[in-house]
């Protein structure tokens, strides 16, 4: 289980309409459910139940986004519509370039994501917990536009890719 280095870039606008970027670094782990490779895209906060809905199945999808899912305590969802792996799969089917799970309240999900899958997803499935998860969710909950960059080695420069 390799370390995933995640850079989150937040877009903040000034009254004049110019945009400034703020970069935050955090770490997670690549799970065996997905590939260990770099990915980048806009952060899209997804409710676990939002991945249950089937009525988008016939859609053409938008690609290149990073799904962020905060998993709830298992007691709050005793009969989930999909397994954690199923949720990751559905997000990727819908165009996600990567999925990040906050497993702080559902640590058992780590084992589910790391069960050796015969058919791992071709996109990264990362999990975060503890202080890194708090940092990520604080950004996500800000209701701002943010972009995540996931790397499997530490970034050489914090803004290497986001040369805004």
């Amino acid at each position: 289980k390799e370390t995933a280095f995640v850079e989150v870039v937040l877009f903040e606008s000034s009254p004049s309409g110019d945009y400034t970027t703020y970069t935050t670094g955090l770490t997670g782990r690549f799970s065996r459910a997905g590939a260990t490779l770099s990915a980048e895209g806009e952060i899209v906060q997804m409710h676990p139940l939002g991945l249950c809905n089937n009525n988008d199945e016939e859609d053409l999808y938008e690609y290149g986004w990073v799904g962020v899912v905060k998993l709830e305590q298992p007691e709050l969802d005793p009969k989930p519509c999909l397994t954690v792996l199923g949720k990751a799969k559905r997000a990727v089917q819908r165009g996600a370039t990567a999925v990040i799970f906050d497993v702080s309240e559902n640590p058992e999900a780590i084992d589910q994501l790391n069960q050796g899958s015969e058919d791992p997803l071709k996109r990264p499935v990362v999990y975060v917990k503890g202080a890194d998860a708090i940092k990520l969710m604080n950004i996500v909950n800000k209701q701002k536009v943010a972009r995540a960059r996931i790397q499997h080695r530490p970034p050489r420069q914090p803004t290497e890719y986001f040369d805004m």
């Epitope: 877009f11 606008s13 309409g17 945009y19 895209g41 806009e42 899209v44 906060q45 997804m46 939002g50 809905n53 009525n55 988008d56 859609d59 053409l60 999808y61 938008e62 690609y63 290149g64 986004w65 996500v140 800000k142 209701q143 701002k144 536009v145 943010a146 972009r147 890719y161 040369d163 805004m164």
Partner: antibody
Framework: EVQLVESGGGLVQPGESLKLSCSAS????????MHWIRQVPGKGLDWVAY???????LYAAAVKGRFTISRDNAKNTLYLELTSLKPEDTAIYHC??????????WGRGTLVTVSS | DIQVTQSPSSLLASLGERVTITCQTG??????LNWYQQRPGQAPLLLIY???SLQTGVPSRFSGQYSGRSFTLTITSLEPEDIANYFC?????????FGAGTKLELR
């Protein structure tokens, strides 16, 4: 079938306000980001604003502080409130589904004319 | 704002001909560039996303390439239904910006 239908356009005088709506159907609206793009008939495209599925927004410099993008996930509707309108805001306003970019689904547009 | 310069502004081509449209950006945007087609009286249609990926349902005669800050849309063999306006869009850094467009007409 995914459908996006804009409404609320019309003829207004400079300095007046207007509120455009984009009614979405055929998909889980609350899962998706949405854009407004405008086009002067016969001319190029002009990106106006974007709202994430959770409510974060971005604006073009030309409309920042005058236009406000919002959404009502319960009503499956996207809005664009236009204030302090100028003649150069005259255009067809399209809504489109997408995250960082307007994707494969666009509405046909609603015409806004600003003239005295 | 990131400047996007699209060329040519208009283009005459014959059926079966290979057509190339270019967009140049004022700074590096990696692969964050899309191509759209717009036929008269219709809403734009997404052809290519992230510079090289063909949108589902779009004919394979359309392709996108890039090198540095230069992006190209190629139609390998022009068909009658390809007569339209074409626009590129950078979505790397807000505010997002479209190219001015290319009007493709039959020779």
């Amino acid at each position: 079938e995914v459908q996006l239908v804009e409404s609320g356009g019309g003829l207004v005088q400079p300095g007046e306000s207007l509120k455009l709506s984009c009614s979405a159907s055929g998909f889980t609206f609350s899962n998706y980001g949405m854009h407004w793009i405008r086009q002067v008939p016969g001319k190029g495209l002009d990106w106006v604003a974007y709202i994430t599925n959770s409510g974060g927004s971005l604006y073009a410099a030309a409309v920042k502080g005058r236009f406000t993008i919002s959404r009502d996930n319960a009503k499956n509707t996207l809005y664009l409130e236009l204030t302090s309108l100028k003649p150069e805001d005259t255009a067809i306003y399209h809504c489109a589904r997408g995250y960082s970019y307007p994707g494969p689904y666009w509405g046909r547009g609603t015409l806004v004319t600003v003239s005295s | 704002d990131i400047q996007v310069t699209q060329s040519p502004s208009s283009l005459l081509a014959s059926l079966g001909e290979r057509v190339t449209i270019t967009c140049q950006t004022g700074q590096s945007i990696n692969n964050y560039l899309n191509w759209y087609q717009q036929r008269p009286g219709q809403a734009p249609l997404l052809l290519i996303y992230f510079a090289t990926s063909l949108q589902t349902g779009v004919p394979s005669r359309f392709s996108g390439q890039y090198s540095g800050r230069s992006f190209t849309l190629t139609i390998t063999s022009l068909e009658p239904e390809d007569i339209a306006n074409y626009f590129c869009l950078q979505h790397y850094s807000p505010p997002y910006t479209f190219g001015a467009g290319t009007k493709l007409e039959l020779r």
